[in-house]
């Protein structure tokens, strides 16, 4: 029997200081470019080596960015989201959602010959 894949979803506030080439990550998504089916949210597609996000270490590729400096990223066109990041200032606060994949073992009862814990 196959294991079930579950996801552990957590949220985190990440504060980054803009570097010479921005905050150090790329984004995809938006109402006009859905990255995840039926979800127009903004996602991190790449963390740039030695950029602000990589040096901080908390933001991960695949994270969903919920807000920038308190401004919600729901229902934004892709370019509007890009513009928010471009104009966010020197010190930037991101609310992000991490989605960690958790692989559970096969579901079923223990066999008679199995060791009992």
């Amino acid at each position: 029997m196959n294991g079930r894949v579950d996801y552990l979803v957590t949220e985190e506030e990440i504060n980054l200081t803009r570097g010479p080439s921005g905050l150090g990550f790329n984004i995809v998504g938006g109402t006009d470019q859905q990255y995840v089916s039926n979800d127009s949210g903004i996602y991190v597609s790449r963390i740039k080596e030695n950029g602000a996000a990589a040096l901080d270490g908390r933001l991960q590729e695949g994270d969903k960015i919920l807000s920038v400096n308190g401004q919600d990223l729901k229902n934004l066109l892709h370019q509007d989201a890009v513009d928010l990041f471009r104009n966010a200032g020197y010190a930037v606060s991101l609310r992000v959602q991490h989605r960690l994949q958790v692989q559970n073992g096969p579901i079923g009862h223990r066999g008679e010959g199995d060791p009992s814990g």
Epitope: P20, S21, G22, L23, F25, N26, I27, V28, G30, Q33, S45, R46, K48, E49, G51, H78, Q79, V82, D83, F85, R86
Partner: nanobody, 126 residues
Framework: DVQLVESGGGLVQPGGSLRLSCAAS????????IGWFRQAPGKEREGVSC???????YYADSVKGRFTISRDNVKNTLYLQMNSLKPEDTALYYC????????????????????WGQGTQVTVSS
């Protein structure tokens, strides 16, 4: 300091070919969505071809089948191979990168890019 420097432009006859180069310094090219843009005298700037950090490509309808974008990550250089050139391809060609967008179509259609080169002139004339 982030810098993009284009080269490879010139005068070519209709039907001819050119290969433009865009050398990047101060950042790693394959971390960015980046593309080629052109502006002819009296016309608006046009996104010609763009490539995402993951290698997805976009081409304007006017150049599909004739132009090819590519990237050499070792040389940290972006290329545009231009074949079957037409007089209407005459323009100043720039490369430009987005610090945030990783969507090649959006980058090519954007007026809000973060790093620009100075451009290289391409003239197609007999």
């Amino acid at each position: 300091d982030v810098q993009l420097v284009e080269s490879g432009g010139g005068l070519v006859q209709p039907g001819g070919s050119l290969r433009l180069s865009c050398a990047a310094s101060g950042f790693t090219l394959d971390d960015y969505a980046i593309g080629w843009f052109r502006q002819a005298p009296g016309k608006e700037r046009e996104g010609v071809s763009c490539i995402s950090s993951h290698g997805s490509t976009y081409y304007a309808d006017s150049v599909k089948g004739r132009f090819t974008i590519s990237r050499d990550n070792v040389k940290n250089t972006l290329y545009l191979q231009m074949n079957s050139l037409k007089p209407e391809d005459t323009a100043l060609y720039y490369c430009a990168a987005s610090y945030y967008s990783d969507y090649e179509v959006a980058v090519c259609r954007s007026d809000a890019l973060d790093a620009w080169g100075q451009g290289t002139q391409v003239t197609v004339s007999s």
